[in-house]
Interface confidence: medium
């Protein structure tokens, strides 16, 4: 069984190589009962999802640009 | 054709014990996780417990942890309930519900695509 | 645990009205919600997954929308077939947990 439905995760495994402007929006999940991993799901702006990798230094820098631009919003 | 089918449901008396089955075809039964959703008369839907493809992970809700035990076997294709020390407040008809993960690249998820078509518990002396 | 408030818990509609049917979580879960149609004496059917998603064979007079805390079922044009009661519920996290349902009913 893989990881997604052996526990209840959402991320099978990452994408690695996204350009930030196709995301459109990044939804940070921490680990819970559910699933023991963080998880990091990208909206891209075709509308499909991209779970990305959280350990990845250009996916720390999405996450921080998108949650600074919330804080404007 | 997709098909879940329970079975086991009765009426108990409070303090016993019943096992719920549901009966899976056509479809890959082990890749896919699996829950039961019960149903009070006239109430809403409750989620009761799921459990993982292999079986390995399982989940319950606060009302029945300790008393009720998911189980499944993958070679028969199907899922179990066991219910212990039952209470009046289980009375319900009990689903049990393939948790479809529609798969887009690099990304699952859990919805309730297929139930089957109820089986009614009755806890009453 | 998350908890799910549908509003309103009944609406009576005629027949080529467009309703809307609201859902909001206790905390955010993001698009992790889908929504279900039943009927009386029946299973539940799957109508919309992971907020705006419209199922296999579903009629595209069913939308969804809604991110974070707050989501909507939208029905326009209803039908017959269409007075049911309806149920959103979680998956963002364990204890899945289910709306309360708003049963949808011929004025």
């Known amino acids: 069984a893989s990881v997604a439905t052996e526990l209840r995760c959402q991320c099978l495994q990452t994408l690695q190589g996204i350009h930030p402007k196709n995301i459109q929006s990044v939804n940070v999940k921490s680990p819970g009962p559910h699933c023991a991993q963080t998880e990091v799901i990208a909206t891209l702006k075709n509308g499909r999802k991209a779970c990305l990798n959280p350990a990845s230094p250009i996916v720390k820098k999405i996450i921080e640009k998108m949650l600074n631009s919330d804080k404007s919003n | 054709e997709v098909q879940l089918l329970e079975s086991g449901g009765g009426l108990v008396q409070p303090g016993g014990s019943l096992r719920l089955s549901c009966a899976a075809s056509?479809?890959?039964?082990?890749?896919?996780?699996m829950s039961w959703v019960r149903q009070a008369p006239g109430k809403g839907l409750e989620w009761v417990s799921a459990i993982s493809g292999s079986g390995g992970s399982t989940y319950y809700a606060d009302a029945v942890k300790g008393r009720f035990t998911i189980s499944r076997d993958n070679s028969k294709n199907t899922l179990y309930l066991q219910m212990n020390s039952l209470r009046a407040e289980d009375t319900a008809v009990y689903y049990c519900?393939?948790?479809?993960?529609?798969?887009?690249?690099?990304?699952?998820?859990?919805?309730?695509?297929?139930w089957g078509q109820g089986t009614p518990v009755t806890v009453s002396s | 645990d998350i908890q799910m408030t549908q509003s309103p818990s009944s609406l009576s509609a005629s027949v080529g009205d467009r309703v809307t049917i609201t859902c909001r979580a206790s905390q955010s879960i993001s698009d992790n919600l889908h929504w279900y149609q039943q009927k009386p004496g029946k299973a539940p059917k799957l109508l919309i997954y992971d907020a705006s998603n419209l199922e296999s064979g579903v009629p595209s007079r069913f939308s969804g929308s809604g991110s974070g805390t707050d989501f909507t079922l939208t029905i326009n044009s209803l039908q017959p077939e269409d007075f049911a009661t309806y149920y959103c519920?979680?998956?963002?996290?364990?204890?899945?947990?289910f709306g309360q349902g708003t049963k949808l009913e011929i004025k």
């Open positions: 056509g479809f890959t039964f082990s890749e896919l996780s």
């Open positions: 519920q979680q998956y963002y996290s364990t204890p899945l947990t």
């Open positions: 519900a393939r948790e479809g993960g529609r798969l887009e690249p690099y990304y699952y998820y859990y919805a309730m695509d297929v």
